[in-house]
Amino acid sequence: MMTGTIETTGNISAEKGGSIILQCHLSSTTAQVTQVNWEQQDQLLAICNADLGWHISPSFKDRVAPGPGLGLTLQSLTVNDTGEYFCIYHTYPDGTYTGRIFLEVLESSVAEHGARFQIP
């Protein structure tokens, strides 16, 4: 029985050219996290592994930075970055927990109206 829950930053918006932090948090379980994967639709962005640390996919190396914590920082945002992002927690013994974040990248003037969704 999986008792844990994933809390995420939910639906967020950010300005084109800016940066955003994607963050998830696993709670309500004593399970041990062995690896966290960050994915955009079906593309792997990054892995944080208990043994090996961080690995950023080569195609995202210029625009993705690890952290803070198990989160992921996306930089130099473009409108094409709009979409769903998933944090996938591999745990022992529970198995896999998945959290979803929807990011909307907006033109500068529009993003100001959505600022309340941004992470400080």
Partner: antibody, heavy 121, light 108 residues
């Protein structure tokens, strides 16, 4: 060959302090979650504390009877885990075991041979 | 905290006999978090069964584990001399993690 070696036990007066150390070899220490477990004739096996891996934010958790008195820490560069024990009581006496657990598709669980702590005046 | 009660506290079995050790929890334990350890005098505990029913490396197939919720058991299908030891159940489903008081299994 997997090895966990505890040290630092001995005789200490009530109210005193002691630091236990455990050095690990033969497995990927940074990926292992580490515990201290103690054993005494009076209380049997008793979980003392754990420290998780970096991916678990090196989170620490403690047994009720040692909370606020004991501190667990780790140094991945030295493959070592420590237990700082303050304000020791007679009931803290026992054999202290270091335990390492690891999951990389299979689950592994390793224990040291233990170090004995005696709290007595 | 979850209290684990093991029974019997001491038991003896003849060679070839079927042995059943039980572990009763004061509240529900998730099965993936229920372990059994074997300990022989002068040695540290050894992982014997994890996740309720998975045998640790090197554990003979005559051992098995089962259970769910608040009731768990370790079974030896046919007792052998090397099985004489103490067996402890352990849960890490909730804090603080706890161990049972153990069952000392002796050879008749």
């Amino acid at each position: 060959e997997v090895k966990l070696e505890e040290s630092g036990g001995g005789l200490v007066q009530p109210g005193g302090s002691m630091k236990l150390s455990c050095v690990a070899s033969g497995f990927t220490f940074s990926g292992a979650w580490m515990d201290w477990v103690r054993q005494s004739p009076e209380k049997g096996l008793e979980w003392v504390a754990e420290i998780r891996t970096k991916v678990n934010n090196h989170a620490t958790n403690y047994g009720e009877s040692v909370k606020g008195r004991f501190t667990i820490s780790r140094d991945d560069s030295k493959s070592s885990v420590y237990l700082q024990m303050n304000n020791l009581r007679a009931e803290d006496s026992g054999i202290y075991y270091c335990r390492g657990a690891l999951y990389d598709g299979f689950y592994f669980d390793y224990w040291g041979q233990g170090t004995t702590l005696t709290v007595s005046s | 905290q979850i209290v684990l009660t093991q029974s019997p506290a001491i038991m003896s079995a003849s060679p070839g006999e079927k042995v059943n050790l039980t572990c009763s929890a004061s509240s529900s334990v998730s099965s993936g978090y229920l372990y059994w350890y074997q300990q022989k005098p002068g040695s540290s505990p050894k992982l014997w069964i994890y996740g309720t029913s998975t045998l640790a490396s090197g554990v003979p197939a005559r051992f098995s584990g089962s259970g769910s919720g608040t009731s768990y058991s370790l079974t030896i299908s046919n007792m052998e001399a090397e099985d004489a030891a103490s067996y402890f159940c352990h849960q890490w489903s909730s804090f603080p993690y706890t161990f049972g008081g153990g069952t000392k299994l002796e050879m008749k």
